[in-house]
Interface confidence: medium
Amino acid sequence: LPAQVAFTPYAPEPGSTCRLREYYDQTAQMCCSKCSPGQHAKVFCTKTSDTVCDSCEDSTYTQLWNWVPECLSCGSRCSSDQVETQACTREQNRICTCRPGWYCALSKQEGCRLCAPLRKCRPGFGVARPGTETSDVVCKPCAPGTFSNTTSSTDICRPHQICNVVAIPGNASMDAVCTSTSPTRSMAPGAVHLPQPVSTRSQHTQPTPEPSTAPSTSFLLPMGPSPPAEGSTGD
């Protein structure tokens, strides 16, 4: 490499390269200084004068050491489905990423060019693979014994609650509806008797211990005669 005492501009030895942060100007045939990030070459070097660098103007940038005559333009403002995660400065371009609930359908070198809303799984379907910054949600039908009653981009299929007595069997889009097995007690007029599930594995309630052998939907019929099902419209 050239001796460190040489000041730019200088002529390199034939076939040689310039030092770090210098470039070979093919017009002047000299090693000249590069401009630092945030600057550009206002005046190119000659055989007798070095590169003159100037700061990038507003809304323009250079991220790398360079000898460009003009700084690069920052990208356009972020769209309504995006958030600005990196502002446009003299040393870096603006970066737009998708806002929550959206994913990047078409990326660019940094950030996202086109955002799309995350798919929502309809009732009877749950999230098989959640959405990421760059991929959409994948839905799957709820397997027997599980359900999803929401239209959501985050909800998974949940196990049906387990009943001592099933009033209405669960399906892919509805939880099982339980009925009470205990004798009806005298109640004040107008009182509502809510069906009591034995246990539930719903995400929305406190889990209670249950035998590991219990099926996800149990049709546990009573051993003897049972009172008429109350609250059979479901809970």
């Epitope: 034939p14 076939g15 040689s16 942060r21 470039y23 070979y24 250079t62 790398l64 050491w65």
Partner: nanobody, 117 residues
Framework: EVDLVESGGGLVQPGGSLRLSCAAS????????MGWYRQAPGNQRELVAA???????NYADSVKGRFTISRDNAKNTLWLQMNSLKPEDTAVYYC???????????RGQGTLVTVSS
């Protein structure tokens, strides 16, 4: 714009050898200068070796006779063969290229070389 990706770094004992490679995502035939520089924690960047498009190599005094730089324009690759490594060679090694069509100095993300017993 050409992207540069370095590989080949790692842990090696003093006196050992490593071969770093720098793969360019596009053609490097129009790139005048390519080279390697290194930076150890708390130190300034040091240009280790460079090679012109004509293939003439140049080396820092500290690595002369131990390191060999080469480039293959057809394979869009730059190499640095490092022999007789010393603990003071420990640093992150960066590949760089002067892209004359764009007017920018491109560089890779770096590969860590650790020389230790």
């Amino acid at each position: 714009e050409v992207d540069l990706v370095e590989s080949g770094g790692g842990l090696v004992q003093p006196g050992g050898s490593l071969r770093l490679s720098c793969a360019a995502s596009g053609s490097i035939s129009g790139i005048y200068a390519m080279g390697w520089y290194r930076q150890a924690p708390g130190n300034q960047r040091e240009l280790v070796a460079a090679i012109s498009s004509g293939g003439k190599p140049n080396y820092a005094d500290s690595v002369k006779g131990r390191f060999t730089i080469s480039r293959d324009n057809a394979k869009n690759t730059l190499w640095l063969q490092m022999n007789s490594l010393k603990p003071e060679d420990t640093a992150v090694y960066y590949c760089y290229a002067d892209d004359y069509s764009a007017g920018f100095e491109l560089r890779g993300q770096g590969t860590l070389v650790t020389v230790s017993s």
